[in-house]
Amino acid sequence: EVEKTACPSGKKAREIDESLIFYKKWELEACVDAALLATQMDRVNAIPFTYEQLDVLKHKLDELYPQGYPESVIQHLGYLFLKMSPEDIRKWNVTSLETLKALLEVNKGHEMSPQVATLIDRFVKGRGQLDKDTLDTLTAFYPGYLCSLSPEELSSVPPSSIWAVRPQDLDTCDPRQLDVLYPKARLAFQNMNGSEYFVKIQSFLGGAPTEDLKALSQQNVSMDLATFMKLRTDAVLPLTVAEVQKLLGPHVEGLKAEERHRPVRDWILRQRQDDLDTLGLGLQGGIPNGYLVLDLSMQEALS
């Protein structure tokens, strides 16, 4: 904290301009009026104040707005945003997407800081849901944003917002998250024709149930192995050899390279060796001929 001293003669700031960068911290404290600063916040970012000087300016704004800054000030914080704590940000009411964009721009290209995470949380909670424009903005700045949300938070994403999601936005999502996102994607893309639908839904298929995979196998989609390997094991296990062959099309040959990895390994163990042999890939580990397969889970369900 800068101690209170009188402003030297002739140094009282009449406007926020570059001459202030040559002021010592105590001079800024003594010579810059908080109300003037608030009305000319848009100039601050164009002036190369040191972070120590920005601390002084922040202190002035804190005194002027102890309950939290108004959005007119927040929108123009620029690099001063980097000096805010999550506690400061929790006092704000940010409703404009333009304000959000302006603040995200300051941290562009860097990891999501606690300040940014708090800002996004405040903004999304204020809106009530993660609408398409917000999601568009957030994933543009932070491609991994969607996968940082819990399944509960993802449940508030309306299906219409799914159109904003790019494949790379889902790279770090785990199965629990995809379980929530897949039904939304299915709903969002339901009116598209077969090949276009598959292109859009492909990134979300890690959340698809068996019946949807069976339906896709009837549509000549030629799923690539990378997508197949991300499918839920429990959704892949009931698929027949014929269904997997149709699902993968020419990519079926890739199963050989993945035969030791899930879900391929577990799927092989569930297939008859005879059926696997029809693929001509040399896949081993299926159920030998003449063995009877009892589905105990089915038996339990019946009793």
């Epitope: 190369p48 972070y51 690099y79 300051v106 941290n107 290209g109 860097h110 990891e111 800081s113």
Partner: nanobody
């Protein structure tokens, strides 16, 4: 992290010239502004010049005599000092601050002595 190393200081006659260099290494992509400060014996450290994007700023005491510049390809900051005066004698420090971490970094300083 950003590391800064100054060079180019020395003893020069009044009216002479010197060029200081500051080599930056580390996370130089995140640098926001770069500055030259100076500190004469027994005084506070004073801001001399700043480069911020394509804009430059100078303290009144050096305006018209000193020129700050930056070569991004070499990650080097310069201070060209002409018409040097005895009162320019000081330790000159290079400073940079970064986006993201909102941190200040300093070099170790280089001594400039102007003899009259």
């Amino acid at each position: 992290q950003v590391q800064l190393v100054e060079s180019g200081g020395g003893v020069v006659q009044a009216g002479g010239s010197l060029r200081l260099s500051c080599a930056a290494s580390g996370s130089t992509f995140s640098i926001r502004a770069m500055r030259w400060y100076r500190q004469a014996p027994g005084t506070e450290r004073d801001l001399v010049a700043v480069i911020y994007g394509s804009s430059t700023y100078y303290a009144d005491a050096v305006k018209g005599r000193f020129t700050i510049s930056r070569d991004n390809s070499k990650n080097t900051l310069y201070l060209q000092m002409n018409s040097l005066r005895a009162e320019d004698t000081a330790v000159y420090y290079c400073n940079a601050d970064t986006i993201g971490t909102a941190r200040d970094y300093w070099g170790q300083g280089t001594l400039v002595t102007v003899s009259s």
